[in-house]
Every structure is written in C-alpha cells, then in structure tokens.
Interface confidence: low
C-alpha cells in the first residue's frame, strides 16, 4: 500500500493531499483512488479529486466538494493491472474551514396549537451541513398578503419548532412562513415560502338532528346533521359519546369520525341495554358543544344455543343437511333463520347459504372434503355456531353421517 497520506492544505471545501508510493509488487501502479471518512459517513467513500484520474506517477491531488466545518481523514488506494491494493494508513483528522450555511430546513409547515398561536415546524439541518459553529435558525412570518416580515432568531441547531403567541392572531388565518439559517460566518438562505394556518377556534355550534337505531344486540348506528348555524371553528370531524343508562356520563366511551361523515356505527355493545348518545364537532383546537342526548336500546342478544343433532346424507352430487330447531330463550331474539357456512377443505374462503327451514340441500362436487357449520340468526345478530362438521370426499353416490 501507499504510505500514509499528508494533508498539506485545507480550505472550506478542498484538501491538498500528498503521499509516497509503496512497493508495486513488480507491476507498475496505474492509478490512485482517494477515499475519505467523516463522523457522518458510513465507512470510507471515494471522493472527487483534481486531477479527476490520478495516474501512477502522481503523488499529489486536491480533493474537492467537501463540506465545510467537518472533520475528515483521507487514505489512498493503489491499483495496477493485477487489481486493487491495500489502502494506505489514514491521514491525520483535520476539520475543513467554516463557511456560510447553504442548506435550508426541509418540510417547513405547522398549524394547530392553542388559541392565538401560530405554530411553525421544520426538519433540522443535519450537523454535517451546518458549515460552521454557532448554527441557528431565523423564522420569518407575516399575515398572508401583508408586506412586513416578522423575524425571530433561534440560536440553537436543534430547534425545530417556534410558537408565536399574540392576541392579534385570528383563528385559522393564513400566514406566509419561511425559515432561514445562519452560523458564525453569517446568514444563509431561507427556505421557500409556505402557507401555515394559525390555531383554530373549537367549533361553536352543536350538531343537529341526532338519531340512533339499533342494528343488532352489539351494534348501534348514529346519524346527525352538520350544525344548523355557521361555526366559527372549522369542523374536522365529530366525536360520538355513548354510555349505558346505569353509568355516569363522565365515564362514557367516545369514538371519532374524520371529515364530513355524518353517521357512524358503534360496535361491541351489550344486548338489551339502554344507551345514551351525544355528538360534538371537533377540530385541532378541541371539541365544541354537545348535541342533545338521544336514547336507544340494543336488541336482545342472538340465540345462545347452537343447532344440534346435525345429520347429513348425500346422493346424486347433493348433500342434504338436517338439524334440530333452535329455540330462543326469553331474553334472546327470535330465530329468523339459519346460516349454513361451508368451504372445501383446501379453500380458505367460506360460502354462506341462508334458509328459514331446518334443512338445506347443497349441490357440491364430490371430489373434495367439506367443512360445514350452521348457526341461527336473528334481529340481535348471529347466534352460536354448531361444531364444525367434516364431510369426507365421497367416491360412491350415496353416503350418510351425523
């Protein structure tokens, strides 16, 4: 390998290097490649040089395109017709000179916050692109359409958020925003101007025309209308609060919808239970006033008894299933019919047939095993399923089982 590299001179973006050749193993060196490493790089990386191609008789080169105020070390790698040799020992570590910052923060945005606030956020500039000590940000903002920028200096490289609080900030009003950079050398560029909205006022009017209906023992559907009067705060969605009659309202559960949806389904409820519901509009500032409360009682639970005594027969590519009628208990919903779920043994998707009888005829090919289960259904939802029945593939035309 070549002997250790010397850094003869260093500027903010360049480094003048020199080295002495090592033994060539009886095959002349045809070229040298310069590699650099920093605290921010993943291992050694090839760097651009002048001259661009360093021949085997050249023992000095200038590395270009370095980042200011970053600690570098360099090494050389020799190559000949046989291949690439071992790298040289690294040079000493040297820091490039400082320079004005050139990279602006990414993703300047913001919004939200509390009343009378303008929240501005951005992604910090990585340390290796700060170009010098004393790095910080200049946050510039102005009401949309106004001439004068308001400026705030944040003397911290880690700052990624600024909140302007002032009673003069109207709810949800647009501001032009840009974020610049500086370091000990002076000011760098600003990011492109973007529009950020100040904090909202929470909705001021309640939703109207609340209506709820029970879909089953476990599910309720709630409908409402947008507030009849114009809200001062924009509406991002609605919060539905619901609680059992025997519980306290402050312990209600809440679900939120997003956007202008004006209905939602509430699931995982108990059967035969009286629920109270109320709806509020919300946005990033909070929730508005509550609608009037409405009441709805979930339907009786579905039958808990599964179908029993299931018998099957097969003939002429048909399977005939019979089972005992399921009787609902007093506190259960009446049986409206039965669902027969079946699938081939190898098939993952299940097919369903509904019937109001206690028998069903399935036309199925006989070259497959079948898995079948039966469950009652009611206004309260689906009842308990029977055990799964496996009907083996039938080679002859007639078979039976239970």
């Amino acid at each position: 390998p070549p002997e250790a590299v010397t850094i003869d001179e260093i500027t903010d973006t360049t480094a003048q290097l020199s080295w002495r050749p090592g033994p060539d193993n009886h095959s002349p060196i045809t070229m040298y490649v310069i590699q650099a490493r920093t605290p921010f790089s993943v291992g050694w990386q090839a760097v651009s040089t002048v001259p661009e191609l360093i021949d085997g008789k050249t023992f000095t080169a200038t590395v270009v395109g370095l980042n200011p105020w970053v600690e570098y070390e360099f090494r050389t790698v020799a190559a000949n017709v046989i291949g690439i040799g071992e790298p040289s020992r690294p040079s000493e570590k040297r820091r490039t000179e400082e320079a004005l910052p050139e990279v602006t923060p990414a993703n300047v945005s913001g919004g939200g916050g509390s009343k009378s606030e303008l929240v501005i956020t951005w992604e910090t500039v990585p340390e290796e692109l700060q170009n010098g000590r004393g790095f910080g940000y200049v946050v510039a903002f102005r009401p949309y359409g106004k001439m004068i920028w308001m400026l705030t200096v944040l003397a911290s490289a880690d700052a990624s958020r600024y909140v302007f609080r002032n009673e003069s900030v109207h709810p949800f009003s647009p501001f032009e925003v840009k974020v610049g950079v500086f370091n000990n050398k002076g000011e760098g560029p600003f990011s492109p101007t973007t529009v950020v909205y100040s904090a909202e006022e929470e909705p001021t009017k309640p939703p109207a025309s609340i209506f709820a209906r029970s879909l089953s023992a476990t599910d309720i559907e709630v409908f409402w209308a947008s507030p009849l009067e114009k809200n001062r705060g924009r509406i991002q969605g609605y919060e539905v609060k619901y609680w059992r009659h025997e519980d306290k309202e402050e312990n209600a559960r809440k679900i939120r919808t997003v956007g202008n949806q004006t209905s939602t389904k509430i699931t995982n409820l108990k059967g035969s239970v009286l629920y109270h519901l109320a709806v509020k509009a919300y946005n990033s500032a909070g929730t508005g006033p509550s609608s009037a409360t409405v009441n709805v009682t979930t339907r009786k639970p579905p039958p808990s008894q599964p179908p029993g005594n299931i018998i099957w027969n097969s003939s002429d590519s048909k399977i005939i299933l019979n089972w005992d009628q399921v009787k609902a208990l007093d506190n259960e919903s009446e049986v409206k019919g039965y669902k027969v779920l079946y699938r081939w043994n190898r098939q993952s998707s299940t097919s369903v047939i509904e019937t109001n009888k206690t028998s069903v005829e399935l036309s199925l090919p006989f070259d497959e095993d079948y898995i079948i289960e039966i469950k009652p259904f009611s206004d309260g939802g689906d009842g308990s399923s029977s055990e799964q029945i496996r009907i083996p593939k039938i080679s002859n035309a007639y078979a039976r089982g239970s």
Epitope: T218, W243, N268
Partner: antibody, heavy 123, light 101 residues
Framework: EVQLLESGGGLVQPGGSLRLSCAAS????????MFWVRQAPGKGLEWVAE????????WYAPAVKGRFTISRDNSKNTLYLQMNSLRAEDTAVYYC????????????????WGQGTLVTVSS | ELTQDPAVSVALGQTVRITCSGR???YGWYQQKPGQAPVLVIY???NRPSGIPDRFSGSSSGNTASLTITGAQAEDEADYYC?????????FGGGTKLTVL
C-alpha cells in the same frame, strides 16, 4: 380494599405457552373491564389486552393479537391470559389491572394494579 | 402513539407540567416508582382518584394532554406515563422521568 394477585409467570422457551391468572377481590368483579399490561425490564408500560365486564368483548395490542387470549371467570373472580407462541420480546413483568369505573374505557383509566408476575422467554 | 418528553426536572415546591401528545379519546396519568406497580393519579383527562393529593391536576386540549403538579414534593420524583385509547387500541406514552431538585 381492591386486591389483584397475579400468578403463573416463569421461564419458558421461545415458541412455548404459559397461562397467567389474576385473583381479584374487594370489588364487584363482573362490573369492571380488566386489563393485562406488561413492562419489559427497564422499559415503559405496554398495554396487552382488555376484556369487558361480562367477558363478551376483548381488545388486543397488535403485537400479541392471534397469540394471546384474555378471558375471565366471573364466578371465580379470576382473570386469565393464555400466551402461546411466546417470543423473546414478550419477556416482561405482566400486571393485572382494573378500570376506574364500571365503564371507564381503555388505558385512560386503570385504577388498580397487581404487583406483577415476571415472564421470561429464553432458550 | 402517545409521545412524552423523556425527562423533566422541577425545583422543590415549584410547578411542573408534563405533556403527552397524540390522538386519544381520553387521557389518564400514572405514577411509577422504582420496583413498584403504577398508580393512577388522573383518569379521563381531569378526574383525580380519591387518595391522590390535589396538587395533581390534568387537562387536555385537542391532541395534547397535560399533567400539572403544583408545588412538587420530593416524593413526587418518579416515572409518569400517560395512557389513552383510539378506536379499539389502548396505548401508553413512553414515560417521563421527573426529578425533584
């Protein structure tokens, strides 16, 4: 006085199973949602599962869904957690806990906690 | 996901505010001391369980909740976790270590 006493923890190999129990006393067990919450050594709290008072509704963290089953026997005032296909990352102290009110919901209102039982998954 | 500052310090007798940001239908706050189980100090945003000193209070606005300790005491030094839910998932914040100086 509310008391929750966990048991069933111990050392188990990856892929193995374990069943935790929690004996509850001092409150009307069937009226309250119950929880399992875990805490890996030196780490924060992680919600595992929740079950409604009657046992009809269950909720699971995505990390355990399909592997863990929460259940309860209201006649015995006991909460269970069946843990299958255990992984090294399931190693933690597992706490049994109860909701603050008869229908307070979720991790916003867990009012009483057991002292925890340590589950170690290691080969 | 609920986000908390990893560490906060307060001088003895002063007021400290611990925040928790992220969507939740409701927020709760838990205090945990080394080797002990957590203790609920605030539930459903603002409610204080019996036995919790009134120097602990909770509030929420939008997608942020706050636990305020007015006149912090030495025994308040602990880890504090926020908890909440969204849809069918419950979640805890990463915890804030409170040091009382």
């Amino acid at each position: 006085e509310v008391q929750l006493l966990e048991s069933g923890g111990g050392l188990v190999q990856p892929g193995g199973s374990l069943r935790l129990s929690c004996a509850a006393s001092g409150f009307t067990f069937s009226s309250f949602n119950m929880f399992w919450v875990r805490q890996a050594p030196g780490k924060g709290l992680e919600w595992v599962a929740e079950i409604s008072g009657g046992g009809g509704s269950t909720w699971y963290a995505p990390a355990v869904k399909g592997r863990f089953t929460i259940s309860r026997d209201n006649s015995k005032n006991t909460l269970y957690l069946q843990m299958n296909s255990l992984r090294a990352e399931d190693t933690a102290v597992y706490y049994c806990a109860k909701s603050a009110d008869t229908w307070s919901y979720g991790a916003a209102s867990i009012s009483a906690w057991g002292q925890g039982t340590l589950v170690t998954v290691s080969s | 996901e609920l986000t908390q500052d990893p560490a906060v310090s307060v001088a003895l007798g002063q007021t400290v505010r611990i925040t928790c940001s992220g969507r939740s239908g409701s927020y709760g706050w838990y205090q945990q001391k080394p080797g002990q189980a957590p203790v609920l100090v605030i539930y459903d945003n603002t409610n204080r369980p019996s036995g919790i000193p009134d120097r602990f209070s909770g509030s929420s606005s939008g997608n942020t909740a706050s636990l305020t300790i007015t006149g912090a005491q030495a025994e308040d030094e602990a880890d504090y976790y926020c908890g909440g839910y969204w849809g069918s998932t419950d979640v805890f914040g990463g915890g804030t270590k409170l040091t009382v100086l």
